[in-house]
């Protein structure tokens, strides 16, 4: 298995390699096979990354930042492979690497441009602040700066506040949207153009449900086929908002097919789950069950939020006793 990196061929002996933060990559270089092979990799034509000659590595003058992070494909050198295996790339490793190869009859140079991207899985959060409701799309660590777009009922909206914090090696970004009083569906897309990776968050508000005390309620949660791929690992969480904070009722992990239920009156239908329907039942309702119920289906590529508002009213019997 090759580490995650992909090559883009550009003219003049120069290739672009794109890697992910903390992952391993290969900087490619090939040459016409020959004897007395000498291989030198240098960064920005100044710092020694890796040296090989007289049939072995010579790393005495290797720049300390590359210590224990580089190696060649030693069994492949005789076949003209001078590629460098590079461990745990960081954003500081971005730049131009030059491979110098000398054989008994020739010298070649290959330039490789390394670009490093970061895309820690974003999240879509639903928050209440006083009387206002907000959707927040956020990504804890991303590089380069991503493109964030919002849609309301599938129509792009221009309002796009972005709260950005830059650290040494990446950005942390929050994009809040005030959705107070709206029944629309919302979609937020965060795109990392370098890694060609897109994440989508989708929020849907269902019609309010009015129930009587001691009844049960069925709340639907079915993923939209556009985003959902059952083959991909995902997590489903049902939570209830009480006085501004969410408490988790239950969650399901697709990888282990485990269901963890924190509320005894909560039930999930196993057969429906197998059909990717995560609707739930809450039995024996009481007045304190009134509130907002949130179903969150999340994977590396999307978050689907479905919100239900439930009003539990006193039953006639309870009312007459008062």
């Amino acid at each position: 298995i090759f580490p995650l990196a992909f090559f883009i061929y550009v003219p003049m002996n120069e290739q672009i390699v794109i890697g992910r933060l903390d992952e391993d990559i290969i900087l490619p270089s090939s040459f016409e096979r020959g004897s007395e092979v000498v291989i030198h990799w240098k960064y920005q034509d100044s710092y020694k990354v890796h040296s090989y000659y007289k049939g072995s590595d010579h790393l005495e003058s290797q720049d300390p930042r590359y210590a224990n992070r580089t190696s060649l494909f030693y069994n492949e050198i005789q076949n003209g492979n001078a590629s460098l295996f590079f461990r745990r790339v960081s954003l500081l490793d971005e730049g131009i690497y030059t491979c110098y190869v000398g054989t008994a009859i020739q010298v070649i140079t290959n330039k490789v441009v390394l670009k490093v991207g970061v895309f820690l899985t974003p999240v879509m959060k639903y928050e209440k602040r006083n009387t206002n409701s907000f959707l927040i799309c956020s990504v804890l660590s991303v590089y380069p700066r991503p493109i964030i777009t919002w849609k309301m009922d599938n129509t792009p909206i221009s309002e796009n506040n972005m709260e950005e914090t830059g650290s040494l090696d990446s950005f942390s970004i929050n994009s809040p949207l005030n959705i107070t009083g709206s029944n629309s569906s919302y979609e937020c897309t965060i795109e990392n153009s370098l890694l060609k990776q897109t994440w989508t968050g989708r929020w849907t508000m269902k019609d309010g449900l009015h129930k009587m005390q001691s009844e049960h309620v069925s709340l639907s949660c079915q993923p939209v086929n556009d985003y959902f791929s059952p083959n991909q690992d995902f997590k489903v969480t049902w939570s209830r908002m009480k006085s501004g904070t969410f408490s988790v009722l239950a969650y399901y992990l697709s990888s282990s097919q485990n269901t963890i239920i924190n509320e005894s009156r909560f039930s999930w239908n196993k057969e429906l789950i197998n059909q990717s329907d995560f609707s739930m039942n809450l039995m024996d309702l009481n007045l304190s069950d009134s509130g907002e119920y949130l179903c969150n289906i999340s994977s590396d590529e999307y978050t689907l939020l479905t919100i239900h508002t439930v009003h539990v009213e006193p039953s006639q019997e309870t009312a007459s006793h008062n």
Epitope: V38, S51, H58, I105, V107
Partner: antibody
Framework: EIQLQQTGPELVKPGASLRISCKAS????????IVWVKQNQGKNLDWIEK????????TYNLRFEDKATLTVNKSSTTAYMQLNSLTSEDSAVYYC??????????????WGQGTSITVSS | DIVMTQSHKVMSTSVGDRVSIICKAS??????VAWYQQKPGQSPKLLIY???TRHTGVPDRFTGSGSGTDFILTITNVQSENLANYFC????????FGGGTKLEIK
Amino acid sequence: EIQLQQTGPELVKPGASLRISCKASGYSFTDYIIVWVKQNQGKNLDWIEKINPYYGTTTYNLRFEDKATLTVNKSSTTAYMQLNSLTSEDSAVYYCARWDYVSTLFAMDYWGQGTSITVSS
Amino acid sequence: DIVMTQSHKVMSTSVGDRVSIICKASQDVGTAVAWYQQKPGQSPKLLIYWASTRHTGVPDRFTGSGSGTDFILTITNVQSENLANYFCQQYKRYYTFGGGTKLEIK
């Protein structure tokens, strides 16, 4: 101090053979290639052959095939070039030079002072 | 074989002038070109490698440029001690030298 010290001038008869030496000092002898270069009366430079002291392997210029034989003595850090079947065409100054591949120069960064050879009867 | 051609055998210049010595390769050699200076009665001395990198101790009045097939060694503010022969050399495949350009001071 890095030095390549060559033997002095030689006057030899046509058809003879001659061995000239190049004593290297001030660096790790097996880490650098020794290249032998000819400079004729017209001041043109031509590489003849090179030797990798670590492997003992040589690579020659086809124009000088069978003209030179290169050897090294690692313990005395000396490179030798034997010139065979000398003719007046071989009258020239012969240089040994260090070819640096260890620091990515890939160039001849140090040269001996040259050995002048005159082939004449 | 790759042929290196220095079309000017001799170039005349005055002290303080700027002079450009030209070298052409018969095929693409990338930047695998070195320049050497040889003063009368001395061995060649490395000035430039990889077409444009100055060797240790070489004054910055010497500048190398070019890639592919066309290379230039430029000497600015020429001094009398710069009277010498200048050779280009390719090391892309084996080694070949140009015929040399003799710099004369008027």
